[in-house]
């Protein structure tokens, strides 16, 4: 049985092969149960977490993961050497930097060790699965009386990243959004000196070095301008608090990355 999986990570051509045992027509064998889909994310090209939903198994099962790179010098089958656990059941595998080859087709195979014929294989393009760390060291400088320039740094090869800048004043509910290319610099031509502005930035591994869909976390916000006025009824913290979710939380040692985390690690 050959099933095409449409994954949310840009790997629409990924193919999963389910190997089924033969069975009597009146009963279902355990080996017919589909294995959970594996989701892999490469964090800043420092390490990669491949995770699966272990709770989808009918009974707690320590599934095993093997991987290799298709049509390359790294095509030897490797066993996972660093499992991630959820309630003492394997739910992921962490691969270190030396095991990551972004531009070779990554093949990942999940297997039920109690039913070796029950296995599923996926092929992934890792360059589409990179999530950079949040931009850092946001700085603002005045270019003229009404013009501001925002700069930031990334702990990554800057030319590989595109950026999204959002800003708003204290009176705004919505953000104004501006795409920025690899130059990691943004100018706001007209600033109202009576208002307090908040800026934040996130980055994505796209389009020059890959086609990733997932953005980094938002940077710490940075503020500019007046933070108090008689007319303004709102309360403000003078400085941005420490980032509430650390980068270690986004995929650190022994940390299971859930899809929910990936979609909701954003500050408002």
């Amino acid at each position: 049985l050959n099933t095409t999986i449409l994954t949310p990570n840009g790997n629409e051509d990924a193919t999963t092969d389910f190997f089924l045992t033969s069975m009597p027509t009146d009963s279902l064998s355990v080996s017919t149960l589909p294995l959970p889909e594996v989701q892999c994310f490469v964090f800043n090209v420092e390490y990669m977490n491949c995770t699966w939903n272990s709770s989808s198994e009918p009974q707690p099962t320590n599934l095993t993961l093997h991987y290799w790179y298709k049509n390359s010098d790294n095509d030897k089958v490797q066993k996972c050497s660093h499992y991630l656990f959820s309630e003492e059941i394997t739910s992921g595998c962490q691969l270190q930097k030396k095991e990551i080859h972004l531009y070779q087709t990554f093949v990942v195979q999940l297997q039920d060790p109690r039913e070796p014929r029950r296995q599923a294989t996926q092929m992934l393009k890792l360059q589409n699965l990179v999530i950079p760390w949040a931009p850092e060291n946001l700085t603002l400088r005045k270019l003229s009386e009404s013009q501001l320039e925002l700069n930031w740094n990334n702990r990554f090869l800057n030319h590989c990243l595109e950026h999204l800048v959002q800003y708003r004043t204290d009176w705004d509910h919505s953000w104004t959004e501006q795409s920025v290319d690899y130059r990691h610099k943004f100018s706001l031509p007209s600033v109202d000196g009576q208002k307090r502005y908040t800026f934040r930035v996130r980055s994505r591994f796209n389009p020059l070095c890959g086609s990733a869909q997932h953005w980094s976390e938002w940077s710490h916000p940075i503020h500019w301008g007046s933070n108090s006025s008689k007319e303004n009824p709102f309360l403000f913290a003078l400085e941005a608090e420490q980032k509430l979710i650390s980068e270690e939380d986004l995929g650190g040692e022994q940390k299971l990355i859930s899809e929910e985390d990936l979609h909701h690690h954003h500050h408002h």
Partner: antibody, heavy 120, light 107 residues
Framework: QVQLVESGGGVVQPGRSLRLSCAAS????????MHWVRQAPGKGLEWVAG????????YYADSVKDRFTISRDNSKNTLFLQMNSLRAEDTAMYYC?????????????WGPGTLVTVSS | DIQLTQSPSFLSASVGDRVTITCWAS??????LAWYQQKPGKAPTLLIY???TLQSGVPSRFSGSGSGTEFTLTISSLQPEDFASYYC?????????FGGGTKVEIK
């Protein structure tokens, strides 16, 4: 999946106080702005108050300013609305709502509501 | 404050009808507008944001348009489950405001 559950509503006399809570689950509460919206019986929706993800900014409708206080406890995934000096016109179903992670930040998830009745 | 005026307040229609609801803003709000649906005894649900962006899971018979001060919500072919109240909301600036609502009833 996102779940918001309001509590603390009830019948209260004019001039008294009430504290509403909204318990959140299924998402990283501490990363999202939250709001209170109310609806008087047979009437439309009225935005009441909002708070940023870290509590650093709070916003109020003119009708409740200086009487209501929005707050949050991110360690307990809970949003609060402290309502003082209640009036008959505060009688309504009170909903808590979560912001969506887009530039426009609409309210993508709502609780089922808790009813507040201000009556002597 | 930005006021939103919705029209009509009530609307009687039949299954299969094309329905249009209008929302006017007292000042320009670009496309900072959302539409919500509310059924009796239930909380509102998000239909459209950014004036025309369909929220995930919302049927394609719903569409939004407009910018500045005039916005419309259109239901191309009214279904039985669409009989409900609809509200616009401006998302531009505080205080946030809702339109007065439009109740869509069965003719």
């Amino acid at each position: 999946q996102v779940q918001l559950v309001e509590s603390g509503g009830g019948v209260v006399q004019p001039g008294r106080s009430l504290r509403l809570s909204c318990a959140a689950s299924g998402f990283n509460f501490r990363n999202f702005g939250m709001h209170w919206v109310r609806q008087a019986p047979g009437k439309g929706l009225e935005w009441v108050a909002g708070i940023l993800y870290d509590g650093s900014s709070k916003y109020y409708a003119d009708s409740v300013k200086d009487r209501f206080t929005i707050s949050r406890d991110n360690s307990k995934n809970t949003l609060f609305l402290q309502m003082n000096s209640l009036r008959a016109e505060d009688t309504a179903m009170y909903y808590c709502a979560k912001e969506e992670d887009t530039a426009m930040v609409p309210f993508d998830s709502w609780g089922p509501g808790t009813l507040v009745t201000v009556s002597s | 404050d930005i006021q939103l005026t919705q029209s009509p307040s009530f609307l009687s229609a039949s299954v299969g009808d094309r329905v249009t609801i209008t929302c006017w803003a007292s000042q320009g709000i670009s496309s900072y507008l959302a539409w919500y649906q509310q059924k009796p005894g239930k909380a509102p649900t998000l239909l459209i944001y950014a004036a025309s962006t369909l929220q995930s899971g919302v049927p394609s018979r719903f569409s939004g348009s407009g910018s500045g001060t005039e916005f419309t919500l259109t239901i191309s072919s009214l279904q039985p489950e669409d009989f409900a109240s609809y509200y616009c909301q401006q998302l531009k600036s505080y205080p946030l405001t809702f339109g007065g609502g439009t109740k869509v009833e069965i003719k």
